[in-house]
């Protein structure tokens, strides 16, 4: 008995060939001996089966002795043994229809679980293997689960169903809803304008939701809301913004925030949360702000940074084109009685400069002591 695997919703063509290469009488029946279709001369006739409106044949092939049964929009319950009766012969074809669906939705939030469920006919014992867009293989039976979806899991998942040494392939497009970056850090000199951007890693026709940027300033004892907003069909409208700092928000995607000036009291870290329509859970992106200030007070030249810096970052003070006068893994460095000239304060990571602030030290003219 020949075995043919089909996919739910697809079309299958079951073949039946006569030894004579001409149009002769044939019938297709199911295992209950109910006629599905056949011919009467050059006419196609249909029986009382459940497949009535979905069954067809290819009349153009009859003259060549081929009498296929075409079943459209396959259903799991179409799985059966189909019998072709031609020239006093019976050809049996076992059709097994499988379906593979993703749980609830193919648009899932980062960190959520993806469950793929295999629909299969009674009595079958298929095995399933799926390959993710990043090449990860998962195997299972009726259900396959992937926990903690990552951004790289977005794309086409290819799943192969194996039954009776035959295989059928399914392709499922999964969209992982996430920000492009889980975390970002902005380095700014005091007084500079700060731009925060929160690009999404997916595109959808309509995007509706709401969000908030919640901020913990390093120098503040508690965190607070900096801005709340709504998103309607990709249009952003600000709901409420704190008075200090007075943030501005772009009206279009990607989500974009502007802080008029970087000040030490704003340095810290924030969490932008976005709730999307028809989604359980929220998208998050962490954003960090590091602010640098270089000052000269009397005979003391000081450079300070505020905000979340890693312990391996180096803060240095150096006179232009000279070796660093002071270099420490600390958040403040200073030089007493600095020489005149252009001084540079540098925040660097393994030699790479992340932030630089220049300050000019003027020469101090010592007034001669009067006799």
């Amino acid at each position: 008995k020949k075995v043919v695997l089909g996919k739910k919703g697809d079309t299958v063509e079951l073949t039946c060939t006569a030894s004579q290469k001409k149009s002769i009488q044939f019938h297709w029946k199911n295992s209950n001996q109910i006629k599905i279709l056949g011919n009467q001369g050059s006419f196609l006739t249909k029986g009382p089966s459940k497949l009535n409106d979905r069954a067809d044949s290819r009349r153009s092939l009859w003259d060549q002795g081929n009498f296929p049964l075409i079943i459209k929009n396959l259903k799991i319950e179409d799985s059966d043994t189909y019998i072709c009766e031609v020239e006093d012969q019976k050809e049996e074809v076992q059709l097994l229809v499988f379906g593979l669906t993703a749980n609830s939705d193919t648009h899932l939030l980062q960190g959520q679980s993806l469950t793929l469920t295999l629909e299969s006919p009674p009595g079958s014992s298929p095995s399933v293997q799926c390959r993710s867009p990043r090449g990860k293989n998962i195997q299972g039976g009726k259900t396959l689960s992937v926990s903690q979806l990552e951004l790289q899991d977005s794309g086409t998942w290819t799943c192969t169903v194996l039954q009776n040494q035959k295989k059928v392939e399914f392709k499922i497009d999964i969209v992982v809803l996430a920000f492009q970056k889980a975390s970002s850090i902005v380095y700014k000199k005091e007084g500079e304008q700060v731009e925060f951007s929160f690009p999404l890693a997916f595109t959808v026709e309509k995007l509706t939701g709401s969000g908030e940027l919640w901020w913990q300033a390093e120098r503040a004892s508690s965190s607070k809301s900096w801005i709340t907003f709504d998103l309607k069909n990709k249009e952003v409208s600000v709901k409420r913004v704190t008075q200090d700092p007075k943030l501005q928000m772009g009206k279009k995607l990607p989500l974009h925030l502007t802080l008029p000036q970087a000040l030490p009291q704003y340095a810290g870290s924030g969490n932008l949360t976005l709730a999307l329509e028809a989604k359980t859970g929220k998208l998050h992106q962490e954003v960090n702000l590091v602010v640098m200030r270089a000052t000269q007070l009397q005979k003391n030249l000081t450079c300070e940074v505020w905000g979340p810096t890693s312990p391996k970052l180096m803060l240095s003070l150096k006179l232009e084109n000279k070796e660093a006068k002071v270099s420490k893994r600390e958040k403040a460095v200073w030089v007493l009685n600095p020489e005149a000239g252009m001084w540079q304060c540098l925040l660097s990571d393994s030699g790479q400069v992340l932030l630089e602030s220049n300050i000019k030290v003027l020469p101090t003219w010592s007034t001669p002591v009067q006799p």
């Epitope: 509706t208 709401s210 709730a275």
Partner: antibody, heavy 119, light 107 residues
Framework: EVQLVESGGGLVQPGGSLRLSCAAS????????MSWVRQAPGKGLEWVAN????????YYVDSVKGRFTISRDNAKNSLYLQMNSLRAEDTAVYYC????????????WGQGTLVTVSS | DIQMTQSPSSVSASVGDRVTITCRAS??????LTWYQQKPGKAPKFLIY???SLQSGVPSRFSGSGFGTDFTLTISSLQPEDFATYYC?????????FGQGTKVEIK
Amino acid sequence: EVQLVESGGGLVQPGGSLRLSCAASGFTFSSYWMSWVRQAPGKGLEWVANINQDGGEKYYVDSVKGRFTISRDNAKNSLYLQMNSLRAEDTAVYYCVREGGQWLALDYWGQGTLVTVSS
Amino acid sequence: DIQMTQSPSSVSASVGDRVTITCRASQGISSWLTWYQQKPGKAPKFLIYAASSLQSGVPSRFSGSGFGTDFTLTISSLQPEDFATYYCQQANSFPWTFGQGTKVEIK
């Protein structure tokens, strides 16, 4: 520790006036929106009014518009509710509330002060 | 004004039971929904913000879901201290409005 302490409640005749005060401590009062929420005896909660950080924005429920005025004094860390032309239906426990929670949530509530409007 | 309708208005349950309270907004409010718990003679306590995010310190047996107009608060396994009245509140537009409350009573 965040603390909100209401005062000024009491018995007043219909048509009369009352001024509620709320003393705030344990947080930077001038950084937060503040609200008044009331609860009639045995009934549910009703938001009454709120005010932004510098007092420039104020919103009220329709039933108190033109009769109640919300105000604040950031130097004194105090929130006020001036209630005029009081009616029997204004009888309730009045709560002073901080709007400091994520997503505009009302995160800290005072213990409430009872206002009874009756002849 | 946006009307908030809670159901049921009261529910009798036993310790360990799963309790679900629903809240429906008369128009879409996105995720601007907060849940509060109030015990007799006490001020309300803030439980859940943005429809589904748990306020820190609130036990994980409490959970919220929903977006737009339909929201739910679920207590997965009722504890003795959970017998109280629960209110939903919208912060989408002024005037802010509360649901009428759902009283969770001991069966």
